[in-house]
């Protein structure tokens, strides 16, 4: 049994780090493998993550963490029984993938303005809470070419757009994702999408 693709890990900078790797053949990850992780810190202890299958030869492990600070560094040991398959380390602050925003809502009752709001996925005491910026994706269900991205570079989890920038009388969907420049994170996953019917009063044309 050998590791074909070494574990790579990302942290949500809150309570979970996710490590993925591939074995050289079909593997029952949860029965055959264990990922041990230990914070490099005085009097710390090793903790065990039981991996799950992620495709035939792929494994994924969700490492529980109390919280994360920039100084944290973990040792990682991948074991198959008594055999050490791989040894590495992981610094969560250098591999951050934020949690996806939630509760995306489209408010359509604001005088021909669409107000999109969503929730910051972090509690106020988390460092990322005040460092997230967002991308909002809006697309038409009827027209695949009608696809747009709005970058929200301010901290408030909301976006206002004129309803008239979208076509009237058709359905649109929106989703939002987050990233944090301070830790050069990857983008989060997209939030679940929300759907609404866009309608607004066309202004009378004057000739």
């Amino acid at each position: 049994m050998k590791v074909l693709q070494e574990p790579t890990c990302v942290s949500d900078y809150m309570s979970i780090s996710t490590c993925e790797w591939k074995m050289n053949g079909p593997t029952n990850c949860s029965t055959e493998l264990r990922l041990l992780y230990q914070l490099v810190f005085l009097l710390s202890e090793a903790h065990t993550c039981i991996p799950e299958n992620n495709g035939g030869a792929g494994c994924v492990c969700h490492l529980l963490m109390d919280d994360v600070v920039s100084a944290d560094n973990y040792t990682l040991d991948l074991w198959a029984g008594q055999q050490l398959l791989w040894k590495g380390s992981f610094k969560p602050s250098e591999h951050v993938k934020p949690r996806a925003p939630g509760n995306l809502t489209v408010h359509t009752n604001v005088s021909d303005t669409l107000l999109l709001t969503w929730s910051n996925p972090y509690p106020p005491d988390n460092y990322l809470y005040n460092h997230l910026t967002y991308a909002v994706n809006i697309w038409s269900e009827n027209d695949p070419a009608d696809f747009r991205i709005y970058n929200v570079t301010y901290l408030e989890p909301s976006l206002r757009i004129a309803a008239s920038t979208l076509k009237s009388g058709i359905s649109y969907r929106a989703r939002v994702r987050a990233w944090a420049q301070c830790y050069n994170t990857t983008w989060s996953e997209w939030s679940p999408s929300t759907k609404w019917h866009n309608s607004y009063r066309e202004p009378f044309e004057q000739h």
Partner: antibody, heavy 125, light 112 residues
Framework: EVQLVESGGGLEQPGGSLRLSCAGS????????MTWVRQAPGKGLEWVSS????????YYADSVKGRFTISRDNSKNTLYLQMNSLRAEDTAVYYC??????????????????WGQGTTVTVSS | DIVMTQSPLSLPVTPGEPASISCRSS???????????VDWYLQKSGQSPQLLIY???KRASGVPDRFSGSGSGTDFTLKISRVEAEDVGFYYC?????????FGQGTKLEIK
């Protein structure tokens, strides 16, 4: 009540051995790291050794490394310090102290918040 | 090893007056924001040491609020807002960021 009670001190000749014990009660012993600190007569405090809750991680002061062994028996809620090759400069009051909560991913530190009453070790010929 | 240097080594104080003890470490003791691994202990005559302050500024359970800790990085201070007769003894700072844990030399607080 959270309590630590040391025993095992006494008079020993240079080169001899002693085994100190520290019995813990009133807290979940296995969850916490434990530490030994000593104090020579008329001197300040000196750290001796520490051990994690599981016993997997152990640290020693250079002055005792290779001569002293820290261990614990979590089934008995007891911490030990085996002292071999004793020297006159090991003469001190030895205290055990409750250290950080080490079962969490990042050990939670609350100071050395409980100390035993101390046991006296005298090394003299 | 991290060296902890305390001052003053002797501190005569009038009851009711404030007192301050300084402790300087040879390297930074801040692991992350709010986590300075510095403690303060009081050892009264013939007794075991007792914890006063941990992580630089957190008061241990049962410690009177006249005791407070402050500082970050390498410079730390223990303050007693109004000294009482029962506060006499030796005060020690200690770093617990790394082994060997190291203590300051101790400050003897006595009543004038």
């Amino acid at each position: 009540e959270v309590q630590l009670v040391e025993s095992g001190g006494g008079l020993e000749q240079p080169g001899g051995s002693l085994r100190l014990s520290c019995a813990g009660s009133g807290f979940t012993f296995r969850d916490f790291a434990m530490t030994w600190v000593r104090q020579a007569p008329g001197k300040g405090l000196e750290w001796v050794s520490s051990i994690s809750g599981s016993g997997d991680n152990i640290y020693y002061a250079d002055s005792v490394k290779g001569r002293f062994t820290i261990s614990r028996d979590n089934s008995k809620n007891t911490l030990y310090l085996q002292m071999n090759s004793l020297r006159a400069e090991d003469t001190a009051v030895y205290y055990c102290a409750k250290d950080r909560l080490s079962k969490t991913i990042r050990p939670r530190y609350y100071g050395l918040d409980v100390w035993g009453q101390g046991t006296t070790v005298t090394v003299s010929s | 090893d991290i060296v902890m240097t305390q001052s003053p080594l002797s501190l005569p104080v009038t009851p009711g007056e404030p007192a301050s003890i300084s402790c300087r470490s040879s390297q930074g003791l801040l692991y992350s924001i709010g986590y300075n691994y510095v403690d303060w202990y009081l050892q009264k005559s013939g007794q075991s040491p007792q914890l006063l302050i941990y992580l630089g500024n957190k008061r241990a359970s049962g410690v009177p609020d006249r005791f407070s800790g402050s500082g970050s990085g390498t410079d730390f201070t223990l303050k007693i807002s109004r000294v009482e007769a029962e506060d006499v003894g030796f005060y020690y700072c200690m770093q617990a960021l790394d082994t060997p844990y190291t203590f300051g030399q101790g400050t003897k607080l006595e009543i004038k």
